[in-house]
Structure formats: structure tokens, C-alpha cells
Interface confidence: medium
């Protein structure tokens, strides 16, 4: 049987080497000489020769300093043989435990740790965690029992102890109130990790804490009073630029300004934010009227895109806006004037007076009137009074110039301001009808076939309006009824059917047709009739000598 006491060896021993560890014995040595040997890691396998055994005495020795952090336990096998080389014992496992010395200081996992905390954070708020490791034995010793401390804080403002560290976990927390990004945007802490629960070997690292922004600063107008001027009637004109400063982080919602006009009920102004420099650009939202109001005093408030995190006073500014008078065009009242007038209105007589008003009540101005568009040249205007009269006969049935019984003329009024301004008015003459047009046939040229002629429809047209139109009366005159007949085609008597009474020779005929409207205005029209060498419905055929209808037998 083997006699092997427990074996442990401290690391980093000084020597001298080899140094005795334990004496191994086999109780078979009573029966004869026993020779000892060892095999395994540290003996005959790498690292070879760290451990040796005296062949005859069984003293196990270490030949060099050990390093627990490299190999913490060696597993060897002891062998015992007699002088003839025969084994007297089965091999026995030997465990050599390397005991720890505090030969490793803690190492931080990073040289620089980065963390962030909101400004104004309350004490107790966790910021970040630093971590260190120690290669020594943390099971059986305190050689790797790390305690964390903060060695320094830069800046030491507003308090030298703004942060604290959990000595056991390395969690850094806020401990003092007063974190203010605008005053101290970053803190640099030197943190220490020391083993032996803070009493042993130590190392340091840096923790950089960024104080992040909250909206704890309002935008402030500087200056708080502004003046600007703008011409009347012009929208989207820049009046002035408002300047603000905001101590919060630039180009963040806590910095970006939002402007509000407190006393612009009419929505006549607008302030937009210049995204580059946060300026407020005051513009007109619509045209202003100098004659209505010459000056505006605006109160403008400024806030941020996001709400204030704290109770802050909203900065306000006063903007005085002077409206500049601009020469405005005279305004016709109404802008479109309708006048009813009979088409037989007397030439040279005044139809109406059409005048414009001068908006520039603060200017003494004279208005001059002219006719700008009068396509039929029917009108003239008094340049001083705006009285409009006829210079020629009106004609409702002049369909080139009159649409739907309405004649449209444009009148302009020009003031004598600087520069000159011109306004336009529209005059609509609603022409009432006079029975000045007799009915006429359509078509006036008609073709018949010599054989089996087809009757032809003739429409009766009157340019006038009812009641000066249908029902019409038609009558063949100058003996035309001898060879021709007519009859009404419809109850309104707006068309007739013409046909020959007998077979006619090929040739051209003239037929006198008297047409009369409902008001007995009549007119005799000569129809041109051609009889063609054909049968049924006639197309256009060759001309023959005219034959007087009245003379035709």
C-alpha cells in the first residue's frame, strides 16, 4: 500500500531548488528494496522536470517556482518497483495543488468606460458599470476579492462628489444633485479596483460620463424689441428676423425654436423658424391694408419643439410693424355692372354711369376713365365722370359681338398716383330685343328632280327673340302659286314644305316667297329653284336659263 500525504505547494517560491515536498512510501519496502519513480504532467510530460523523485528515498521534490495562474493542479502517478524491476505496487495518482499568492493585480476590462446620465438626474440614478477581473484565486482567498472606489472626479463641480460607486459591483450612481449639461457636459472619473477587499493590489481606469440634455433652458429673445415695415397688399414678405438663444444642445428638439404670435387673430402674420440658426422669420401671411391699419404691434412668444422639462418662463418679444402706403388701382363698384338696354337705344344718349372708387383715401387723386374693350365700337365714355353713351346703333342680332343677348365692354379707370395705377371694370349690356328682323327662308337655293320630284323642307329663321318670331306665316306671291304649293311642316310653323304642282321642264326658276313673323313683320324673298334631269331626291345639277315663276305656264 502507498503512504502519500496531501501535497500542496505555494506558487512563486524562492528556493533553493530542488525543494522537498513530501516523502512517498510503499509499505512493500519492508519486504525488500523499493525504487520509486513518477510519471505524468510536470514529470515526464510537459512541463517536463518540474517535479522529480529520489529513486531510493521517495522524496518528491519541486525543481522551480510554480505559477498557479498557469497550472493550478498537477496530476502525477507514482510507481514502485523491486530491484529486479518488477512492480511491487499499482501506480498511484498524486494531486499536487498550487496554492495562490496575491501576485496578480486586478485588471479593468477597458481602459476607458463610457456612460451617460440625464442632466438633473436625481441621486440614486444608475449611470454605468465598470468591471475589473483578477487572475488570482477567488474561491479560497481574498486575493481576487475586488473593491471599487472613485479616486478623483474632474471637474469637481458643482460638488466634488457628484457620483459614487458600489464598492462590490462597480455600478456608478449619481449621489449629489446639480448635474447640468450646460455647465458641465462631461465628467471624468478615475476609478480604482483593489483586491484583498480593497486593501491589496490595485489598478485604475477612466470612466467618462456624458451629461445628456433635457429641455431645461428656454429660448430667450435677444433683443426683445424689433421694428419692421412692409408694403401693403403683399403676402409672404419678410418683415424682420427675430433672434433667440437657447443654452440646450444645438440642433435638438430642446433647442429648436417654435414661435407663436400671441395677438394675430386675423392670421395676417406668420413666423417660421430658420433651421440653421433658429432665427424666427416674421412674414406677412396675407396682404395688409394701409388704409385699414397703418401699424401693428405684435407680441411673439418662443418655446421649443418639445415641452419644457421644468417650469420655465416663456420669453416674449414685441415687434412693431409699419404698413407702407402703396398707390392702389381704383376699384370699380361693382366690378361687373349689368345694364339692360333696348337694341334700338338712341345714338348719343347716356346708357349708364360706371365709376370707380379710389382706395388710397390718404392720397388726393383724380380718376380718368377710358374704354378698354368695345369690339363693336358702339360706346364712348366721359373721361371725368364715367358716363357711358352710344356712339352707334346697337344690334342684339350682331352675333359676332353679342353673346346670349349680352354685349361685354371693359372700362378702365386710371389714377394720377406715382406710379400710375389702373383698375378694370366689366360692363355687361343686356340688349333687349326689338322686332327689327323679318323671317328668312333657309335654304334659298333648292333642287328638284324632273321625274317623281321629292318635296323640299324650307326652314324659316328669324334673328329676333320671341314674341318677334314664330309662328310664321308663309305665302307664295307674284303668281308662284300657279306651279308650286307650300304647306306648314309643324305646328309652330317654323318650316314649310315646297313642291311643284305638275311636271316641270328641266331648268332654273325663281319663286317669290313672302314670310311674316308673329308681329306681322314681313319680307319677300326670292327662292332659286333648279329642276334637274333626275328622279326622286335631287343632288346638285347643271344650271339652265332662269325662268320667271310668275311667267311660267
Amino acid at each position: 500500500d502507498w503512504v502519500i500525504p496531501p501535497i500542496s505547494c505555494p506558487e512563486n517560491e524562492k528556493g533553493p531548488f530542488p525543494k522537498n515536498l513530501v516523502q512517498i512510501k510503499s509499505n512493500k519496502d519492508k519486504e525488500g528494496k523499493v525504487f520509486y519513480s513518477i510519471t505524468g504532467q510536470g514529470a515526464d510530460t510537459p512541463p517536463v522536470g518540474v517535479f522529480i523523485i529520489e529513486r531510493e528515498t521517495g522524496w518528491l521534490k519541486v525543481t522551480e517556482p510554480l505559477d498557479r495562474e498557469r497550472i493550478a493542479t498537477y496530476t502525477l502517478f507514482s510507481h514502485a518497483v523491486s530491484s529486479n524491476g518488477n512492480a511491487v505496487e499499482d501506480p498511484m495518482e498524486i494531486l499536487i495543488t498550487v496554492t495562490d499568492q496575491n501576485d496578480n493585480k486586478p485588471e479593468f476590462t477597458q481602459e476607458v468606460f463610457k456612460g451617460s446620465v440625464m442632466e438633473g438626474a436625481l441621486p440614486g440614478t444608475s449611470v454605468m458599470e465598470v468591471t475589473a477581473t483578477d487572475a488570482d484565486d477567488d474561491v479560497n482567498t481574498y486575493n481576487a476579492a475586488i473593491a471599487y472606489t472613485i479616486l478623483s472626479q474632474d471637474p469637481e463641480l458643482p460638488d466634488k462628489n457628484m457620483f459614487t460607486i458600489n464598492r462590490n459591483t462597480g455600478v456608478i450612481s449619481v449621489v449629489t444633485t446639480g448635474l447640468d449639461r450646460e455647465s458641465f457636459p462631461t465628467y471624468t472619473l478615475v476609478v480604482q479596483a483593489a483586491d484583498l477587499q480593497g486593501e491589496g493590489l490595485s489598478t485604475t481606469a477612466t470612466a467618462v460620463i456624458t451629461v445628456t440634455d433635457t429641455n431645461d433652458n428656454p429660448p430667450i429673445f435677444n433683443p426683445t424689441t424689433y421694428k419692421g415695415q412692409v408694403p401693403e397688399n403683399e403676402a409672404n414678405v419678410v418683415i424682420t428676423t427675430l433672434k433667440v438663444t437657447d443654452a440646450d444642445a444645438p440642433n435638438t428638439p430642446a433647442w429648436e425654436a417654435v414661435y407663436t404670435i400671441l395677438n394675430d387673430d386675423g392670421g395676417q402674420f406668420v413666423v417660421t423658424t430658420n433651421p440653421v440658426n433658429n432665427d424666427g422669420i416674421l412674414k406677412t401671411a396675407k396682404g395688409l391694408d394701409f388704409e385699414a391699419k397703418q401699424q401693428y404691434i405684435l407680441h411673439v412668444a418662443v418655446t421649443n419643439v418639445v415641452p419644457f422639462e421644468v417650469s420655465l418662463t416663456t420669453s416674449t418679444a414685441t415687434v412693431t410693424v409699419d404698413v407702407l402706403d402703396v398707390n392702389e388701382a381704383p376699384i370699380f363698384v361693382p366690378p361687373e355692372k349689368r345694364v339692360e338696354v333696348s337694341e334700338d337705344f338712341g345714338v348719343g344718349q347716356e346708357i349708364t354711369s360706371y365709376t370707380a372708387q379710389e382706395p388710397d383715401t390718404f392720397m388726393e387723386q383724380k380718376i380718368t376713365y377710358r374704354i378698354w374693350r368695345d369690339t363693336a365700337n358702339w360706346l364712348e365714355i366721359n373721361p371725368d365722370t364715367g358716363a357711358i353713351s352710344t356712339r352707334a346703333e346697337l344690334d342684339r342680332e350682331d352675333f359676332e359681338h353679342v353673346k346670349n343677348s349680352t354685349y361685354t365692354a371693359l372700362i378702365i379707370a386710371t389714377d394720377n398716383g406715382s406710379p400710375v395705377a389702373t383698375g378694370t371694370g366689366t360692363l355687361l349690356l343686356i340688349l333687349s330685343d326689338v322686332n327689327d328682323n323679318a323671317p328668312i327662308p333657309e335654304p334659298r337655293t333648292i333642287f328638284f328632280c324632273e321625274r317623281n320630284p321629292k318635296p323640299q323642307v324650307i326652314n324659316i329663321i328669324d334673328a329676333d327673340l320671341p314674341p318677334n318670331t314664330s309662328p310664321f306665316t308663309a305665302e307664295l306671291t307674284h303668281g308662284a302659286s300657279a306651279n308650286w304649293t307650300i304647306q306648314y311642316n309643324d305646328p309652330t310653323q317654323e318650316s314649310i314644305i315646297l313642291k311643284p304642282k305638275m311636271a316641270l321642264e328641266v331648268g332654273d326658276y325663281k319663286i317669290n316667297l313672302k314670310l311674316m313673323d308673329n308681329q306681322n313683320k314681313d319680307q319677300v324673298t326670292t327662292l332659286e329653284v333648279s329642276v334637274c334631269d333626275c328622279e326622286g331626291a335631287a343632288g346638285v345639277c347643271r344650271k339652265a336659263q332662269p325662268v320667271e315663276a310668275g311667267l311660267q305656264i
Partner: antibody, heavy 117, light 111 residues
Amino acid sequence: EVQLLESGGGLVQPGGSLRLSCAASGFTFSSYAMSWVRQAPGKGLEWVSAISGSGGSTYYADSVKGRFTISRDNSKNTLYLQMNSLRAEDTAVYYCASWGDGTLNPWGQGKMVTVSS
Amino acid sequence: QSALTQPASVSGSPGQSITISCTGTSNDVGAYNYVSWYQQHPGKAPKLILSEVNKRPSGVSNRFSGSKSGNTASLSISGLQAEDEADYYCSSFTSGLPWVLFGGGTKLTVL
């Protein structure tokens, strides 16, 4: 002299509301986080709520969360505690206190709040 | 988080010394040096007598001293006087809510 003076306590029925005020003087009020601590009759101290110096951050004990609101007006050097939906177990002396360097100091004189029908 | 543990009462005769313990955990007392002690006389507000384990505010008698070992802090009062009879509360900073933990209080009786 640094001083904190509470006001606004009294008797209120369960479910009712009350607002405590704490007027500060003798120190830069806006630079300090402030806290409310209460003490039920014959009992120990219990932290209730806290607010950062700027007023941007507020914290509450679980027992009062959703019912109490802490606020401050730095222009008036005054701390407030709005207490709604009061319960019998909210009966206590309420103290305001300033927080600095891991310590509550100074403390107000305290104000009794009694919740009873 | 539970309160810090203090003895309910201690007593001593005038001129004697007494010690009041305050036991927490490795996340509060054991983790930080921000342990404070408050004295409260009946019907009065708490008064700070020690901060950061052993720092006395001006005006506080040097008979009051503090110490800390591991997760336990201690308040010692030497040369007991009648006016020392009061309730004593310890508190510790803790990361997270609530950021101040109180002990249950210790009643000191001067015999």
C-alpha cells in the same frame, strides 16, 4: 439661516385630496434635489417622493405612485406634494428635506396629515 | 427593498458609552460610504448628527462618532447625557429607488 417650513396639512376624508407646501430659505433652492419623508404615528421614517433641482425628474415610492404628485416652483423657492385618493394608511407627519451628498439635511418641522372619516 | 436593521432600544446611564448598530446589505451600507444618522426628540423633526459614516455637521457634539465594517454601520455615543434620550435613525444611500433607506429606529433611554 437654512430653513424649511411646511404648510397645508390637516384632516381629510378617505378618497379626498390635500396639498402640502414647503417654503425654503437660506440656500440656493434650485440647486438641490428635494424629498418628502413621512412618519406614521409611533412608526419609523418612510421615504415618499423626490424631485430634481430643475424639476425635470420625479420619483415616487410604490405606496404612493399614481396618487401623489411632487412639484416645485423655483421662482417661489417652494416644494409641493399634491396628495389625491388619500387612504387611512397615509396618515402621518410629512417632512420635506433637502438632499445633498447622500444626506437629507435640513428637515422641515413636519405637518400632520390625518385621513379619517 | 427592506429597511436597514437597528435594535429597537438601547439604554445606558449618564456618563456611560453606548453603540447602536445598523445592518444593511452589500448593495447599500456595504457598497457606499453614505451612511447617515439622525436624532429625533419626541414631537420634533429628525436632526442630522452624522453623515458619510463619521462626519459631524457643525454644532454636533464630538461625543457622537460613527464607523462601518462590511454591511454594518455603528453609532457610538460617549459620556451619555440626559438630553441624548431620543430616537436614532440610520440611513444609507442606495442606487435606484428608494435612493435613501432608513433603519427602523432605536429608542435610547438614559437611565
